[in-house]
Amino acid sequence: EVEKTACPSGKKAREIDESLIFYKKWELEACVDAALLATQMDRVNAIPFTYEQLDVLKHKLDELYPQGYPESVIQHLGYLFLKMSPEDIRKWNVTSLETLKALLEVNKGHEMSPQVATLIDRFVKGRGQLDKDTLDTLTAFYPGYLCSLSPEELSSVPPSSIWAVRPQDLDTCDPRQLDVLYPKARLAFQNMNGSEYFVKIQSFLGGAPTEDLKALSQQNVSMDLATFMKLRTDAVLPLTVAEVQKLLGPHVEGLKAEERHRPVRDWILRQRQDDLDTLGLGLQGGIPNGYLVLDLSMQEALS
């Protein structure tokens, strides 16, 4: 902490300007009024202060606002935001999307820091839900943002916000997250026609149940292999050879290249070899002719 020393004569700051970069730390502490700093925060960003000097400015704001900074100051923090700790940010009440954007801009190009994560958490909790504008903003800065949320947090996303989601935003989502997002997407896109619906829903299909995949197989959707490989194993396994053929359309030939990979491998093993042979792809490993097909999973679960 900086010692309290009197400001040298003639050095009292009347405004926040470039002359302050020549002030020593103790001079900044003594000669810059915290209230002045708060009202002229927008100027700080344009001045090349050292990290040590920024520490002093932060200290002054902390003293002025021990309960947390007002939004008028937060919006203009600029690079001073990088000096904030998650504990500092938890004291804030950020309600304006413009404030959020301004602070995210400071961290742009970097991974999501604990400070940014705390800021977003405070903002979203303050709003009560992840509305479309917020989601648009967050995924623009952090494409992986959606997949960083827990299934519980995702449940607060309204279906209307799903329109803001791009395929790349779902790249790192796991099955539990897609299980939550898929029904919302289904609801959001329900009024679209077949081919348009498929284009929109495709990225969310990692959360689709078997019944929905069966329904899609009747709609000539021609699902690509990359999407098929991301489907839930338990959703793929009950599909028949005919259903998979219809689901993939011309892409069915790609099964050969994926036959050692899941979920294709698991699916092949459950099909009759006779049925696999009808595809003409040389897929091997199906149930031999004359074999009794047993599914004891339910029986075992009950015993």
Epitope: D174, K230, L237, D266, L294, L296
Partner: antibody
Amino acid sequence: QVQLQESGPGLVKPSQTLSLTCTVSGGSINNNNYYWTWIRQHPGKGLEWIGYIYYSGSTFYNPSLKSRVTISVDTSKTQFSLKLSSVTAADTAVYYCAREDTMTGLDVWGQGTTVTVSS
Amino acid sequence: DIQMTQSPSSLSASVGDRVTITCRASQSINNYLNWYQQKPGKAPTLLIYAASSLQSGVPSRFSGSRSGTDFTLTISSLQPEDFAAYFCQQTYSNPTFGQGTKVEVK
């Protein structure tokens, strides 16, 4: 509750064939949700997947061991077996049989049996 | 074969610590990643499957996450019974394991 138990000789001579059997109790091998798996662990080292078999008889082997490995299933005895030919001292390890659930992972394991290759 | 690079190979921690172990796949494996715990002289036990799903009976202090081909196992507050070795395993193609991480008492 399903349990697995490995059995077989604890000492095998170099160049001979290592043979182990895993007995499944409390459940059926004839279940399309499972792969019946063999895994080994060299002393103080990590885990190495040897291969697995599906109830229909389809097998999958570790490419580095494929030429020496045979896994078979006897559904009537609720057993599956491992044969590893032309063994050397490098095959000395704890051998585990395990059940892999297609929806989860290796959810049931045997307690493991130590096999030493030595003359 | 798909290589799984696990780190660190060992770590020292105290009861109550937050512990993070990572595994990187040499290519995309979607979510086909499991985590196991192994205590000396015992067979491994399944903790997490499909990258983030908790196996039945496993305490909620264990969690898993994925970012692309990087996977993380987190123990939120280490308990005395958690000192053990941990392994990741991919099952997307022929299964392979990470080299393991030994969690020891600091």
